[in-house]
């Protein structure tokens, strides 16, 4: 069978080889398409309800005024010329529709390096057959499930027209120290060959490089956190990040009801001040980051100060914040 590709909505003429150019003609067309269950026979004499879809022209050709999805299938003509010689024509018709130019919607203006980001959603409407969407980074194809690239796809079919809408959501994890303005684009490739891809306008989000989080350092004075009763302990939370984050304090895993401050002074230490202390730095762009915990303990006179004392009471005693 000869393969014919026709655009939806356009007319199509299929020639009946060997048919006399004018009536009387001995020919018949047989169709097996989405509009038929088996074979439907159309003859030159038989104008009727099928004329809106396919009719035999005076020269024996079959005319389809506006090809539709249901017209995909096999078309056969059997004709006899004036000398009684029989000729058969056989066509396999496939239809297509090129969608509108694809678009990237919900696109991100900024991506964060080192974490997964949604770049945007590519949408193509009105294709047949469905076709495919693919993403490109700086003109090169992006391969899903490779190097932090993931794609979520969805295909919907219009209940009346039968045309397809495709959606493709791109997630990427930009590498640290990579291109600060990558160029993403999306292209639609038709399901039928010989039709070029349609590409979206590119988008160029900025890549924001988060300052690598250096550890929050908790410095205790005196070193080791062991102090005689009535002594003073100074805890200093050192955070290299700029701008300076807010510092909150924890004792035995419970936040202390104190205003934010990088320094915590425990004057006149008593048993109620013993426990495990840590500080929490809260950055505007990151989550909270907690320091290591240090143990504050009281040593009785004559005892050696341990590097880490045991956990004591739960009282707060007198606290001073620098």
């Amino acid at each position: 069978a000869q393969n014919i590709t026709a655009r939806i909505g356009e007319p199509l003429v299929l020639k009946c080889k060997g048919a006399p150019k004018k009536p009387p003609q001995r020919l018949e067309w047989k169709l097996n398409t989405g509009r038929t269950e088996a074979w439907k026979v159309l003859s030159p004499q038989g104008g009727g309800p099928w004329d809106s879809v396919a009719r035999v022209l005076p020269n024996g050709s079959l005319f389809l005024p506006a090809v539709g999805i249901q017209d995909e299938g096999i078309f056969r003509c059997q004709a006899m010329n004036r000398n009684g010689k029989e000729t058969k024509s056989n066509y396999r018709v496939r239809v297509y529709q090129i969608p509108g130019k694809p678009e990237i919607v919900d696109s991100a203006s900024e991506l964060t390096a080192g974490v997964p980001n949604k770049v945007g959603t590519c949408v193509s409407e009105g294709s047949y057959p469905a076709g495919t969407l693919s993403w490109h980074l700086d003109g090169k194809p992006l391969v899903p499930n490779e190097k932090g690239v993931s794609v979520k796809e969805q295909t919907r079919r219009h209940p009346e027209t039968g045309l397809f809408t495709l959606q493709s959501e791109l997630m990427v994890t930009p590498a640290r120290g990579g291109d600060p303005r990558p160029t993403f684009s999306c292209s639609f490739s038709p399901g039928l060959p010989r039709h070029r891809a349609l590409r979206t306008a590119p988008i160029q989000p900025r890549v924001w490089e988060p300052v690598p989080l250096e550890e929050v350092q908790l410095v205790v004075e005196p070193e080791g956190g062991a102090v005689a009763p009535g002594g003073t302990v100074t805890l200093t939370c050192e955070v290299p990040a700029q701008p300076s984050p807010q510092i909150h304090w924890m004792k035995d895993g419970v936040p202390l009801p104190l205003p934010p401050s990088p320094v915590l002074i425990l004057p006149e230490i008593g048993p109620q001040d013993q426990g495990t202390y840590s500080c929490v730095a809260t950055h505007s762009s990151h989550g909270p980051q907690e320091s290591r915990a240090v143990s504050i303990s009281i040593i009785e006179p004559g005892e050696e100060g341990p590097t880490a004392g045991s956990v004591g009471g739960s009282g707060l005693g007198t606290l001073a914040l620098a």
Partner: antibody, heavy 119, light 107 residues
Framework: EVQLVESGGGLVQPGGSLRLSCAAS????????MTWVRQAPGKGLEWVAS????????YYPDSVKDRFTISRDNAKNSLYLQMNSLRAEDTAVYYC????????????WGQGTLVTVSS | DIQMTQSPSSLSASVGDRVTITCRAS??????VNWFQQKPGKAPRRLIY???NLADGVPSRFSGSRSGTDFTLTISSLQPEDFATYYC?????????FGGGTKVEIK
């Protein structure tokens, strides 16, 4: 909302003529075939004529061929049936209906107009 | 020409009954059959298109089926408003042909 309104029916003598009209609204008229169907008093439905969406092709059963002519004016969203050489057996309610080809069948109908052929 | 033989020509039934009306085409008409309901003094109303598809706004108690050249309209549970005359139509070939009609009356 699709609406089809027939007019032009009435009493006519055998051998006489009558022109029926059908005003269409609520849809894109020139996208559809249109059809006339009739129903004699107390009887069933009978196809009378169909016309394609452009008006280039018309179709009739043998019972009315050469006597009736279907036409349309797409600019006016109107369908017509010119009936000549009327006979007593043409007495019926005449309905205008949307469709008549394989893509639609007949989906919407007007309320009908009565044609009486009698002397 | 294609003949559409509709049966029965009339039937009596009660509210709640299951009613079946059949049209047999004299030759293959594919699935190009419509079913209509007509009440006295009113225009026909399409119930089923392409043999098995329910038209918009038609109650789901109506259904259409096909076996070869036999087409069936079924009303699963007859309602008072369903007493009317029903017609089938083939629109695969000209002349378009209607069945003779089935009058559904109250028992």
């Amino acid at each position: 909302e699709v609406q089809l309104v027939e007019s032009g029916g009435g009493l006519v003598q055998p051998g006489g003529s009558l022109r029926l009209s059908c005003a269409a609204s609520g849809f894109t008229f020139n996208n559809y075939w249109m059809t006339w169907v009739r129903q004699a008093p107390g009887k069933g439905l009978e196809w009378v004529a169909s016309i394609d969406n452009s008006g280039d092709n018309t179709y009739y059963p043998d019972s009315v061929k050469d006597r009736f002519t279907i036409s349309r004016d797409n600019a006016k969203n109107s369908l017509y049936l010119q009936m000549n050489s009327l006979r007593a057996e043409d007495t019926a309610v005449y309905y205008c209906a949307r469709g008549g080809d394989i893509t639609t069948g007949l989906d919407y109908w007007g309320q009908g107009t009565l044609v009486t052929v009698s002397s | 020409d294609i003949q559409m033989t509709q049966s029965p020509s009339s039937l009596s039934a009660s509210v709640g009954d299951r009613v079946t009306i059949t049209c047999r085409a004299s030759q293959d008409v594919g699935f190009y059959v419509n079913w209509f309901q007509q009440k006295p003094g009113k225009a026909p109303r399409r119930l089923i298109y392409r043999a098995t598809n329910l038209a918009d706004g038609v109650p789901s108690r109506f259904s259409g089926s096909r076996s070869g050249t036999d087409f069936t309209l079924t009303i699963s549970s007859l309602q008072p408003e369903d007493f009317a005359t029903y017609y089938c139509l083939e629109f695969d070939e000209h002349p378009l042909t209607f069945g003779g009609g089935t009058k559904v009356e109250i028992k």
